[in-house]
Interface confidence: low
């Protein structure tokens, strides 16, 4: 076997915050099954972040199967917290920040920064797109901003 | 095939460091997470946490957050988990298993699927 | 942290029996659970990932099932090699957790 390290990019939109699942089915792929109904379900897509529609063959698959798009959202979506941004009120550190490094359970692999508590310094890390912790910044700076001293 | 090969049974006095090494083969060690489990004499199985070999990221169960070290040497395809100011309820066998990245999209992939063959570690005065 | 609680803790029975094993989540799990089968001395085995794949290499006598908190293994008709202690593990969110294992002896 290829001792090579492999590079996976399955998610391209680095815009997006961090994403928080509410139950980890949201994060499977959309399954039809093996059977050959044609029944219009919804899933959750993990890449786009948006219920989408998809044909399920009638049997089979698996959870991220639903019947309307409202309970698709129900069950996959909530509102991302605002970020806390330190002011001159807030000058501890928000608890996330020591959190470890956690590329969460998909593999999407974007670049993304965290706040290292050995090192008492920000650095890359490679975010799996979904699940993971607040201790997840888009930039060196916001990083640097909210968790460095 | 797939290997993970760790080192011989140490003996130890509480307050001391072990630090134990599985030596992976057959397989792209990068590719996947390393994790590490416990199993004190006559008990059941403990997670202690993984460390990703290509980042070097880890992340420890609480319980052991602040005692326990997982560092990988990619050169050699050998992760270690070191734990240090060691109590006699420390003594256990200690594992190491191959896990994958979690999951990619559905999990349809084995997880924990190769298994070290276990370091005893005794800790006795 | 999600609890992972197996029942029975022991069992006895005989060659050509079927078995069953559960265990069950302190909270919903989807079908992140495997099953793993352990012989003194030796490290744990994977039989069954998410749920109800029976891992490469693992006799058809062994199967899994459930979704959420509650979830099963069973034997369908259990040979001499198969008395050992078996766990289940979440693999759901951190910290992964595993029951307390159930012993499965010759009556």
């Known amino acids: 076997d290829s001792e090579e390290d492999e590079e996976h990019t399955i998610i391209t939109d680095t815009e997006l915050p961090p994403l928080k699942l509410m139950h980890s089915f949201c994060a499977f792929k959309a399954d039809d099954g093996p059977c050959k109904a044609i029944m219009k379900r919804f899933f959750f897509n993990i890449f786009t972040r948006q219920c989408e529609e998809f044909i399920y063959g009638g049997c089979e698959g698996n959870q991220n199967r639903f019947e309307s798009l409202e309970e698709c959202k129900k069950m996959c979506t909530r509102d991302n917290a605002n970020r806390i941004i330190k002011t001159t009120l807030q000058q501890e550190k928000p608890d996330f920040c020591f959190l470890e490094e956690d590329p969460g359970i998909c593999r999407g692999y974007i670049t993304r920064y965290f706040y290292n508590n050995q090192t008492k310094q920000c650095e890359r890390f490679k975010y799996g797109g979904c699940l993971g912790n607040m201790n997840n910044f888009e930039t060196l700076e916001e990083c640097k901003n909210i968790c460095e001293d | 095939q797939v290997q993970l090969v760790q080192s011989g049974a140490e003996v130890k006095k509480p307050g001391a460091s072990v630090k134990v090494s599985c030596k992976a083969s057959g397989y792209t060690f990068t590719g996947y997470y390393m994790h590490w489990v416990r199993q004190a004499p006559g008990q059941g199985l403990e997670w202690m946490g993984w460390i990703n070999p290509n980042s070097g990221g880890t992340n420890y169960a609480q319980k052991f957050q602040g005692r326990v070290t997982m560092t990988r040497d990619t050169s050699i395809s050998t992760a270690y988990m070191e734990l240090s100011r060691l109590r006699s309820d420390d003594t256990a066998v200690y594992y190491c298993?191959?896990?994958?990245?979690?999951?990619?999209?559905?999990?349809?992939?084995?997880?924990?699927?190769?298994w070290g063959q276990g370091t005893l570690v005794t800790v006795s005065s | 942290a999600i609890q992972l609680t197996q029942s029975p803790s022991s069992l006895s029975a005989s060659v050509g029996d079927r078995v069953t094993i559960t265990c069950r989540a302190s909270q919903g799990i989807s079908s992140s659970l495997a099953w793993y089968q352990q012989k003194p001395g030796k490290a744990p085995k994977l039989l069954i990932y998410?749920?109800?794949t029976l891992q490469s290499g693992v006799p058809s006598r062994f199967s899994g099932s459930g979704s959420g908190t509650d979830f099963t293994l069973t034997i369908s008709s259990l040979q001499p090699e198969d008395f050992a202690t078996y766990y289940c593990q979440q693999l759901d969110s951190y910290p992964l957790s595993f029951g307390q294992g159930t012993k499965l002896e010759i009556k």
């Open positions: 298993a191959r896990g994958i990245a979690r999951l990619q999209w559905l999990p349809t992939e084995a997880d924990f699927d190769y």
């Open positions: 998410a749920a109800s």
